[in-house]
């Protein structure tokens, strides 16, 4: 059962794994939310009946009934972990915190002209986990000023103390705002020789880099497979360090293989959710429970549904026996991953993907693309939306595309002449034009945010957010699309396809069924020589074949330019101007998305 | 844990010059200032200067111009140089951690006699 | 350069006592004023740093208090491992300088 609000005054009893400390119980909820076992927690407040060394405590919890009972004590605040919920988590956490000097180990000392600026440095220091910035209040001058970087083996302060004139906060790594590179490649054949901080055991490399990417100290790592040599290494996944933030020698080596935390694109690709199956693999651990299940998929729904569980192995029925049905052990562990993975005993295992919903829901898997042709077919562009305006008469304006349960990303040349945002309709999870009717349901508009440097779109700045008067359930034909990662500015993308319902040649009218084009990236030199006219900026991106033919239209604007990398969807343009349609040696013109991320973020973001 | 070690020549002769070394663990010199204080045997401390985490020096004016603090990050050791010792120079000499202009964590110190 | 003046070198006291040391800086050094103990052949030790706070396993008898130029160390019922010097320092402004000290003994 979900239960999301703190109980004040109240401390649960018994139950200990273990003490941080945390600015807030909010956090402290957080922080229990993300750690392999804890299901409950204390945190103190500070207060003038507690003793100060326990101000900021977090004590995370488990039991097996999954609640503890409960006892009065002044500033202590309780509460239940996010484990037990459904919704969408996230580990975000931009609140200064007044006053409070959150301790761990310095490593960098200096001087910023805000706390903004100390955040910001802390967010693309890949070491930083949070920081303390001393106001130009502060009572020693010298110190004014002065940004400390810190770090700690946790992730969290080792101590947390009341300091007048110091602010401190956390890296916004997870809030997706972190310009430190994204390196998604793992290396074959490759051992990192640097010092380990954690080992755990892990299936294969891709689990491997994902519980690097949320272990805080991780930066990269180093996978033994399980043809590895020796036996006793093998599926182990050693987690690493160094003080450049870069493997220092990498040794040549069969069966392992390496590679990086996906710190700062994990709000693009999946790093808790584990969904693979492994065959004729067991996964040992303490045991949880045995249950019957039909099929492995059954097992891993089981576990998922079973809040302790982090785990389970399943065992296929003999014959005939037990209605078909085979044996689902569900298992945990003190830090989520098996204790040991042995092969060849005919199992099936794998995790439980309750953990998922701490990944975006951009990440997921959508139905395989239907290849060849022009006609999309339903949810094969979930993100897509079309935008109605209902004046004077109700028509197709403009293409959007889903970037949050509440926000639709577009170009912001489509509201020239909108008065209002009341006149506008958003339908998601359309596919024909002529499903929409008097009664479909749509949704309404609270709010229209055009860039406030936007003059037209040639000029760039083509982008805009509508914030919706509801949320968007998310489910098979409507759900977001992911934003590139800052980190992802080199990445060159191939497999690009610009949608919408706008004219398949100048002169023609809004197309009934969604279309669909692949159209290959231009590089902004290229672009420029096409259009000399105009000033092709980096914050503009351009697609289209040489010789014409395929291109966005009229009414395909704000749109998204899609592109697949690594599995996921990236929305990489929004479609902006271009001079015609299709035509040759004329590339259409996109907003380019990854250089909007903060202005995206700070608007949707904003308390 | 935390600890800083000075180690110096113990003797040094009048108008020589003194080199002594704060060897440090548990923490980054990147990340905290280090400061050199003195203590002349029987009297009170004295403030000598100290450099910060980003390398910037502060002296204590009456002695600026026979001193130089510099460090080795990657070595996590501090230097203080001083020249042209007399005899009232003879004192103990500490380093010792910043921590928002106060001293959290000393050295043990090591003796410096200026004698001929 | 800034002066901090600690106006008795030597305090007498009994285990049990009250105690208040006085430190005076020659100008406003705000709140950044830190106190520290010396034991004969020990380091100081950090007790009170930015006039009130008290360092890490520090006993809650001894605080600091003051603001400016004028202020106040107080040990509230001394014990026998109180008997030290003990030193007052402008943490406010480079160079940062040090009181005279204070002896406290056994009366």
């Known amino acids: 059962e979900c239960v999301t609000q703190l109980l004040k005054d109240t401390c649960f009893e018994g139950g200990d794994i273990t003490t941080v400390f945390t600015p807030s119980a909010k956090y402290c909820q957080v922080v229990c939310t993300y750690h392999p076992r804890c299901l409950l927690f204390t945190f103190t407040a500070e207060s003038p009946s507690e003793d100060p060394t326990r101000w900021f405590t977090c004590v995370l919890k488990d039991s097996v009934t999954e609640t503890l009972p409960r006892v009065n004590r002044t500033a202590a605040i309780s509460g239940y972990s996010f484990k037990q919920c459904s919704h969408q988590i996230s580990a975000c956490n931009k609140d200064i915190y007044v006053d409070l000097d959150m301790k761990g180990i310095n490593y960098n000392s200096s001087v910023a002209k805000s706390a903004q600026e100390c955040q910001e440095r802390c967010t693309d220091d890949v070491h930083c986990h949070f920081f303390t910035y001393a106001t130009r209040q502060f009572p020693s001058l010298e110190h004014r000023n002065i940004c400390l970087l810190k770090h700690t083996q946790t992730g969290t302060p080792t101590r947390i103390t009341k300091l007048d004139k110091v602010v401190s906060g956390f890296s916004l790594k997870s809030c997706a705002l972190s310009n430190l590179a994204c390196i998604r490649d793992i290396f074959p054949n490759t051992v990192f020789a640097d010092s380990n901080i954690d080992s755990v055991m892990a299936p294969d490399a891709f689990v491997c880099g994902r519980i690097c990417t949320h272990h805080p100290g991780c930066l990269f790592f180093t996978f033994f497979s399980q043809e590895w040599p020796k036996e006793s290494q093998r599926n182990l996944c050693l987690l690493k360090t160094s003080e450049s933030g870069l493997p220092s020698t990498r040794i040549k080596k069969s069966k392992a293989l390496s590679g990086f935390s996906l710190q700062s694109c994990r709000h693009s690709i999946p790093v808790f959710c584990h969904s693979s199956f492994y065959h004729d693999t067991d996964f040992l651990g303490e045991e949880l429970d045995i249950v019957a299940a039909k099929s492995h998929e059954a097992c891993q729904k089981l576990c998922t549904n079973a809040v302790r569980c982090q785990f389970f192995t399943y065992t296929p029925a003999q014959a005939s026996c037990n209605e078909g049905k085979g044996k689902c052990y569900l298992k945990l562990s003190s830090n989520g991953s098996p204790t040991k993975i042995l092969h060849g005993r005919g199992g099936i295992s794998g995790y439980t993907l309750r953990l998922c919903k701490m990944d975006n829901e951009c990440t997921t898997k959508i139905k395989p693309r239907i290849v060849g042709g022009t006609a999309s077919v339903r949810g094969e562009w979930p993100w897509q939306v079309t935008l109605h305006t209902t004046s004077p008469t109700q028509r197709h304006l403009c293409g959007g595309s889903i970037i949050g349960n509440q926000w639709i990303l577009t170009a912001a040349h489509c509201f020239y002449g909108v008065e209002s945002p009341k006149i506008l309709r958003v339908y998601s999870g359309i596919l024909n034009q002529s499903e929409i009717k008097e009664d479909t349901s749509f949704f309404g508009v609270q709010e229209i945010i055009i860039h406030d440097q936007y003059k037209m779109a040639e000029s760039g700045y083509d982008i805009a957010l509508l914030k919706l008067e509801t949320t968007v359930n998310y489910t098979d034909s409507q759900r977001p699309i992911c934003l590139p990662s800052k980190g992802d500015r080199n990445v060159i993308y191939t497999d690009c396809w610009v949608t919408g319902w706008g004219y398949r040649k100048l002169r023609d009218k809004i197309q009934n069924t969604l279309q669909k084009a692949k159209i290959p990236l231009v590089t902004n030199e290229e672009c420029q020589k096409r259009y000399r006219g105009h000033k092709i900026t980096h914050k503009m991106i351009c697609a289209g074949y040489r010789e014409g033919g395929k291109d966005a239209c009229k009414g395909d604007s704000g749109g998204p330019l899609s592109c697949k990398h690594n599995e996921v969807w990236h929305l990489v343009g929004i479609t902006s101007w271009g001079e015609g349609c299709a035509q040759r040696e004329r590339p259409g013109v996109y907003t380019n998305v990854v250089e909007y991320v903060d202005w995206i973020l700070e608007k949707t973001q904003a308390v | 844990q935390v600890q800083l070690e000075e180690s110096g020549p113990g003797l040094v002769a009048p108008s020589q010059s003194l080199s002594i070394t704060c060897t440090v663990s548990?923490?980054?010199?990147?990340?905290?200032?280090i400061y050199w204080v003195r203590q002349p045997p029987g009297k009170g401390l004295e403030w000598l200067g100290m450099?910060?985490?980003?390398?910037?020096?502060d002296y204590n004016s009456a002695l600026k111009s026979r001193l130089s603090i510099s460090k080795d990050n990657s070595k996590s050791q501090v230097f203080l140089k001083m020249n042209s010792l007399q005899t009232d120079d003879t004192a103990r000499y500490y380093c010792?951690?910043?921590?928002?202009?106060?001293?959290?964590?000393w050295g043990q110190g090591t003796t410096l006699t200026v004698s001929s | 350069d800034i002066v901090m003046t600690q106006s008795h070198k030597f305090m007498s006291t009994s285990v049990g006592d009250r105690v208040s040391i006085t430190c005076k800086a020659s100008q406003d050094v705000s709140t950044a004023v830190a106190w520290y103990q010396q034991k004969p052949g020990q380091s100081p030790k950090l007790l009170i740093y930015?006039?009130?706070y008290r360092n890490t396993g520090v006993p809650d008898r001894f605080t600091g208090s003051g603001s400016g130029t004028d202020f106040t160390f107080t040990i509230s019922s001394v014990q026998a491992e109180d008997l030290a010097v003990y030193y007052c320092q402008q943490h406010y402004k480079t160079p940062y300088s040090f009181g005279g000290g204070t002896k406290l003994e056994r009366l």
């Open positions: 930015l006039t009130s």
């Open positions: 548990g923490f980054s010199l990147t990340g905290y200032g």
């Open positions: 450099i910060w985490g980003d390398g910037r020096t």
């Open positions: 010792a951690r910043d921590y928002y202009g106060s001293k959290d964590y």
